[in-house]
Interface confidence: low
Amino acid sequence: EEAGARVQQNVPSGTDTGDPQSKPLGDWAAGTMDPESSIFIEDAIKYFKEKVSTQNLLLLLTDNEAWNGFVAAAELPRNEADELRKALDNLARQMIMKDKNWHDKGQQYRNWFLKEFPRLKSELEDNIRRLRALADGVQKVHKGTTIANVVSGSLSISSGILTLVGMGLAPFTEGGSLVLLEPGMELGITAALTGITSSTMDYGKKWWTQAQAHDLVIKSLDKLKEVREFLGENISNFLSLAGNTYQLTRGIGKDIRALRRARANLQSVPHASASRPRVTEPISAESGEQVERVNEPSILEMSRGVKLTDVAPVSFFLVLDVVYLVYESKHLHEGAKSETAEELKKVAQELEEKLNILNNNYKILQADQEL
């Protein structure tokens, strides 16, 4: 099967001024489709313009497998898919031309990653070791307490990784509550940085020391602070898909399907709000069809479909993956201790895989700089 590499954002090496756009976006469909289809294309373009980031649009257009997944989820007939693609190509050019500093920003965060990765790598390796040690000791936990890697549905990254922040949550706490990062900090389309919230958890037999807990939490929050300071107000320029192509393409595809069905039913589609929705919570058409939430695929599913090593910026996103992912510790009334131990081991392995990807991208960037 032909596939473009995952998360491949093909953006200009410089500002592309070679394509002045004289035609309105809707004109792509003119003369080649029936009027209803043309109107659907316009609706779809409006949706992309207002609700999909430039990065994600480019991903969709530069990655054949992502595009095919989108077309399948949207249930688009071939002629409409072709016309929509042309129109989106046109839209992408316009969006790119609006952001003249894109390339410079990319270089900025690549440089940042090159500088910071060696230290991050060392700390991540340390945390992986700790996770494995904790997994070995998990049998000491009270039978009634397990740790579930329950991910906020709005997160659009791997569903099975207890990352740095996750490692420092409530199982370590003495008092049963801990300030967490806001689950709204997903790496989906919104990627908004908004405050903090708290979470509580019943804790079982205390077998992690307060020192371990404190250490992991502080390290995590320190990293978050670094990244936040570095990115400042421009966070949304960098946090795009960050790995979950599957979720993005299906999510947008289902939104477009809803738009198309609504148009087919001759019902008006609600005007898309200016705020970008989460991919996992697509808008609904007035036809009443609620587009279902996209289920988070497993790590294995994603590793088959999401090829992260192809793109330098992904390295940076994966650092954010490690820093930002918010995992809640959850008290499960059922569940054996052995499952918890296995889960932690799996988490350590997945984190190690992420680190390997980061390391690989670091080498690529290093080689690129040396040339």
């Epitope: 473009g4 590499a5 995952r6 491949q8 954002q9 093909n10 953006v11 200009p12 090496s13 410089g14 592309d16 070679g18 394509d19 480019l58 257009l61 530069t62 990655d63 693609r85 190509d89 992408a92 050019r93 790119i96 990319g106 090829k307 992260l308 090593t309 192809d310 793109v311 330098a312 910026p313 690989n360 080498k363 690529i364 960037l365 080689a367 690129d368 040396e370 040339l371």
Partner: antibody
């Protein structure tokens, strides 16, 4: 370095696999491409295989060629050669950092292997 | 499908002179363009990528420019050794299918 092998005289319709053996290159870090050149003609891009193993082909090459790789080799399978496939086939490594983000450019090339398709 | 079209061959100029080769993409390739030099019986050599970035070891006499669909390779202070065929290549493999990422080639003759 890159070294292509497997080029030979074949009859039309007989599948042929060309192999590019790499040394000193980590294929998990580089995209690799196949380009061909018919005698006296220009370069013709066939396709690429990314560092992670994803493939992308020229529109005319889809179905006619398959690119795959191991840790030390990159293969190009010509599924059903025709006389038009007679050419020197080059294996090429994308420069470090080449991605969809920056574009794929080939800065290391093999010497090429000649495939002749004739009945 | 994206097609790359180059200046017709041959282009000739005297030693010390300047030659300009144009390359046009059928649609925008967002500055993702490379230039290669190939001499008879040899493998291609990357000169410029990203439309204007000089590959390591390539003399600064070679200059690439352009954006969108129009790109140019300029070789100044021509030397005899510059006699070769030059190819442009789209490094952009998205949005549309690629018929051939390479242009047809332009032969440069140095007098």
């Amino acid at each position: 370095s890159l070294e292509e092998s497997g080029g030979r005289l074949v009859t039309p319709g007989t599948p042929l696999t060309l192999t590019c053996t790499v040394s000193g290159i980590d294929l998990s870090s580089y995209a690799m491409g196949w380009v061909r050149q018919a005698p006296g003609k220009g370069l013709e891009w066939i396709g690429i295989i990314s560092s992670s193993g994803s493939t992308h082909y020229a529109s005319w090459a889809k179905g006619r060629f398959t690119i795959s790789k191991t840790s030390t080799t990159v293969d190009l399978k010509i599924t059903s050669p025709t006389t038009e496939d007679t050419a020197t086939y080059f294996c090429a490594r994308a420069r470090a950092g080449s991605t969809y983000y920056t574009g794929y450019y080939f800065n290391l090339w093999g010497q090429g292997t000649l495939v002749t398709v004739s009945s | 499908a994206i097609e790359m079209t180059q200046t017709a061959s041959p282009v000739s100029a005297a030693v010390g002179g300047t030659v300009t080769i144009n390359c046009q993409a059928s649609e925008s390739i967002y500055s993702n363009l490379a230039w290669y030099q190939q001499k008879p019986g040899q493998r291609p050599k990357l000169l410029i990528y990203g439309a204007s970035t000089l590959e390591s070891g390539v003399p600064s006499r070679f200059k690439g420019s352009g954006s969108g669909t129009e790109y140019t390779l300029t070789i100044s202070d021509l030397e005899c050794d510059d006699a070769a065929t030059y190819y442009c290549q789209s490094g952009y493999y998205g949005i549309s299918a690629i018929n051939n990422a390479f242009g047809g080639g332009t032969e440069v003759v140095v007098k």
